[in-house]
């Protein structure tokens, strides 16, 4: 058993049929010694008396809010949560496996630049009685500070018969050094509590590996005289690190119709313009990637050919 | 050329070669398969490699003030990785595929380090740790980690030279 926060405790249980469970001793936070009784949740049934209560925690029926009273007055509470371990593996029932970029990916994180600011998100099908708490640091043995905000519900989607909820959190490294080569990864830890179930999820990454620039901005077309060709120009996204002579991007320019199966024109360039062949009913799209480190491509920015 | 006396390097040449290094480092990476390094106890095997850190003057402002500190750091790293790529970690079993870009990578690291420090001038170089994995699978894992680390190192070096070529070239 360990303390998650004041008056909230996590009991770690090996979860298998007829498991013996964990013996837990609760102590009433009071100077009183006599006439103390214990109850669980909203029940008035007295579970025991005395300053301490010893219980055998085996299942979710044994978890909940234990309250010690004296003469009708509440003295203190202890909330017990369960953390299940099945076959040596901690349960991951609360969050959905996003399976990208690999199996058992529950947290996904992205950064728009090298400023030390990043966003992480996760998915669940649970809609109520759900709380998240997020902590982060650079490195684990001698951690350097990363400040995270509160996790918020950022999107709701219908997936077949189920509703899926996306939560996200923004974090900022306290003393970021955008130009340096990272040697210690960022660690992100998410505590998830659903009713009386506790789970924790972690992710470890370098900012450089989660970079995904915003799409290029201000796409403009200029038809070339006596030619099917069009000069397309664009600018670096506002959110990208500066100066651009140092933090350079490379671009992919593509002309394609509405269907992915249609023919296309495609060219890669380090410049902020390119000449392509425009077709009726097609769109010109441009996306960006860090020029020197192969992290993710941005989403496409598009303009119609016409 | 960046010499200890403090003259400027051939920024444009360094830019071209460092960009080539980036391309080679990424084409060498798939050679050793895909695995998550952080699940493999990353710290103890690759924390000895030289990293370009915050105080090394490799940021745009630091380069404007005095590029020598940064260039010396890059030079140290290039020599370090050049020696690692020539060591038995890469030459031992399992043999690299004959078409491995590691050979080109090795030569290009040497080429860039020579551009930065011509014959006859000497910056102090960092000791190469004795990483001698006994098992072929350990060697494979170590190659992977070194190449991943090299990708990050050459990316910073390429940014430095691109910025230098754009803003510091005579």
């Amino acid at each position: 058993i360990w303390e998650l926060k004041k008056d909230v405790y996590v009991v770690e249980l090996d979860w298998y049929p007829d498991a013996p469970g964990e013996m837990v001793v609760l102590t009433c936070d009071t100077p009183e010694e006599d006439g103390i009784t214990w109850t669980l949740d909203q029940s008035s049934e007295v579970l025991g008396s005395g300053k301490t209560l010893t219980i055998q925690v085996k299942e979710f029926g044994d978890a909940g809010q234990y309250t010690c009273h004296k003469g009708g007055e509440v003295l203190s509470h202890s909330l017990l949560l369960l953390h299940k371990k099945e076959d040596g593996i901690w349960s991951t029932d609360i969050l959905k496996d996003q399976k990208e970029p690999k199996n058992k990916t529950f947290l996904r994180c992205e950064a728009k630049n090298y400023s030390g600011r990043f966003t992480c998100w996760w998915l669940t099908t649970i809609s109520t009685d759900l709380t998240f708490s997020v902590k982060s640091s650079r490195g684990s043995s001698d951690p350097q500070g990363v400040t995270c905000g509160a996790a918020t519900l950022s999107a709701e989607r219908v997936r077949g018969d189920n509703k899926e909820y996306e939560y996200s959190v923004e974090c900022q490294e306290d003393s970021a050094c955008p130009a340096a080569e990272e040697s210690l990864p960022i660690e992100v830890m998410v505590d998830a509590v659903h009713k009386l179930k506790y789970e924790n999820y972690t992710s470890s990454f370098f900012i450089r590996d989660i970079i995904k620039p915003d799409p290029p901005k201000n796409l403009q077309l200029k038809p070339l005289k006596n030619s099917r060709q069009v000069e397309v120009s664009w600018e670096y996204p506002d959110t990208w690190s500066t100066p651009h002579s140092y933090f350079s991007l490379t671009f992919c320019v593509q002309v394609q119709g509405k269907s992915k199966r249609e023919k296309k024109d495609r060219v890669f360039t380090d410049k902020t313009s390119a000449t392509v062949i425009c077709r009726k009913n097609a769109s010109i799209s441009v996306r960006a990637q860090d020029r020197y480190y192969s992290s993710s491509w941005s989403e496409w920015a598009s303009v119609p050919c016409s | 050329r960046a010499v200890p006396g403090g003259s400027s390097p051939a920024w444009t040449q360094c830019q071209q070669l460092s960009q080539k290094l980036c391309t080679l480092a990424w084409s060498a990476h798939p050679l050793v398969g895909h695995m998550d390094l952080r699940e493999e106890g990353d710290e103890e095997t690759t924390n000895d490699v030289p990293h370009i850190q915050c105080g090394d003057g490799c940021d745009p402002q630091g380069l404007r003030d005095n590029s020598q500190f940064c260039l010396q750091r890059i030079h140290q790293g290039l020599i370090f990785y050049e020696k690692l790529l020539g060591s038995d970690i890469f030459t031992g079993e399992p043999s690299l595929l004959p078409d491995s870009p590691v050979g080109q990578l090795h030569a290009s690291l040497l080429g860039l380090s020579q551009l930065l420090q011509p014959e006859g001038h000497h910056w102090e170089t960092q000791q190469i740790p004795s990483l001698s994995p006994s098992q072929p699978w350990q060697r494979l894992l170590l190659r992977f980690k070194i190449l991943r680390s090299l990708q990050a190192f050459v990316a910073v070096a390429a940014r430095v030279f691109a910025h230098g070529a754009a803003t510091l070239s005579p």
Epitope: R228, Q229, T250, R261, E262, K263, K264, D265, R266, V267, F268, T269, D270, T275, I277, R279, K280 | S27
Partner: antibody, heavy 118, light 107 residues
Framework: EVQLVQSGAEVKKPGATVKISCKAS????????LHWVRQAPGKGLEWMGW????????EYAPKFQGKVTITADTSTDTGYLELSSLRSEDTAVYYC???????????WGQGTLVTVSS | DIQMTQSPSSVSASVGDRVTITCRAS??????LHWYQQKPGKAPKLLIK???QSISGVPSRFSGSGSGTDFSLTINSLQPEDFATYYC?????????FGGGTKVEIK
């Protein structure tokens, strides 16, 4: 299977015009760009131009502008290359090539030898 | 027009050898570079697209690398069927242009 089958060899006199064909099969003709590339005996490859069979748009290499005409007939899934004012240096193997991507060549015809000789 | 220069123009090698062919562009072309193989009397065949992307059905012994102005095609462990002429082609801008070719001959 995506295939391009070209018409047979031609022998022409200088100043004449020749029209060679390239019949596509195994795919929807208008879904691919069609290019023409030539190769003089013992020499390298030279790109001449392309056509989008869907709308008839064409683009030619400056060297061949006015010299060649590329057309396409979607009713027969056939592309054509017409070369005018033939000279001995136009003696070459002419290849048609196709791809869904405009700028490189995924599928090639077997080639048509055009010999210009008096 | 962008000029493409291949070297060497010919190379003699034995089965099992590793052969590297280089291609240099007269200006930066990012990764807009493709490689073809041509055997005598046959049409060219696409081997690599966009400098390093493999083509389905092409043996993995063919690999490409490079960006900007310098590119290479490597044939690992040359097979008897690999004796042919190899061409690079830039697609950075029109007109599309090819290198002069590199003939890989039996030693």
């Amino acid at each position: 299977e995506v295939q391009l089958v070209q018409s047979g060899a031609e022998v022409k006199k200088p100043g004449a015009t020749v029209k060679i064909s390239c019949k596509a099969s195994g795919y929807t003709f208008s879904d691919y760009y069609l290019h023409w590339v030539r190769q003089a005996p013992g020499k390298g490859l030279e790109w001449m131009g392309w056509i989008d069979p869907e709308n008839g748009d064409t683009e030619y290499a400056p060297k061949f502008q006015g010299k060649v005409t590329i057309t396409a007939d979607t009713s027969t899934d056939t592309g054509y290359l017409e070369l005018s004012s033939l000279r001995s240096e136009d003696t070459a193997v002419y290849y048609c090539a196709a791809n869904k991507e405009l700028r490189y060549f995924d599928v090639w015809g077997q080639g048509t030898l055009v010999t210009v000789s008096s | 027009d962008i000029q493409m220069t291949q070297s060497p123009s010919s190379v003699s090698a034995s089965v099992g050898d590793r052969v590297t062919i280089t291609c240099r562009a007269s200006q930066s072309i990012s990764i807009n570079l493709h490689w073809y193989q041509q055997k005598p009397g046959k049409a060219p065949k696409l081997l690599i697209k966009f400098a390093s992307q493999s083509i389905s059905g092409v043996p993995s012994r063919f690999s490409g690398s490079g960006s900007g102005t310098d590119f290479s095609l490597t044939i690992n462990s040359l097979q008897p069927e690999d004796f042919a002429t190899y061409y690079c082609q830039q697609s950075n801008s029109f007109p599309l242009t090819f290198g002069g070719g590199t003939k890989v001959e039996i030693k």
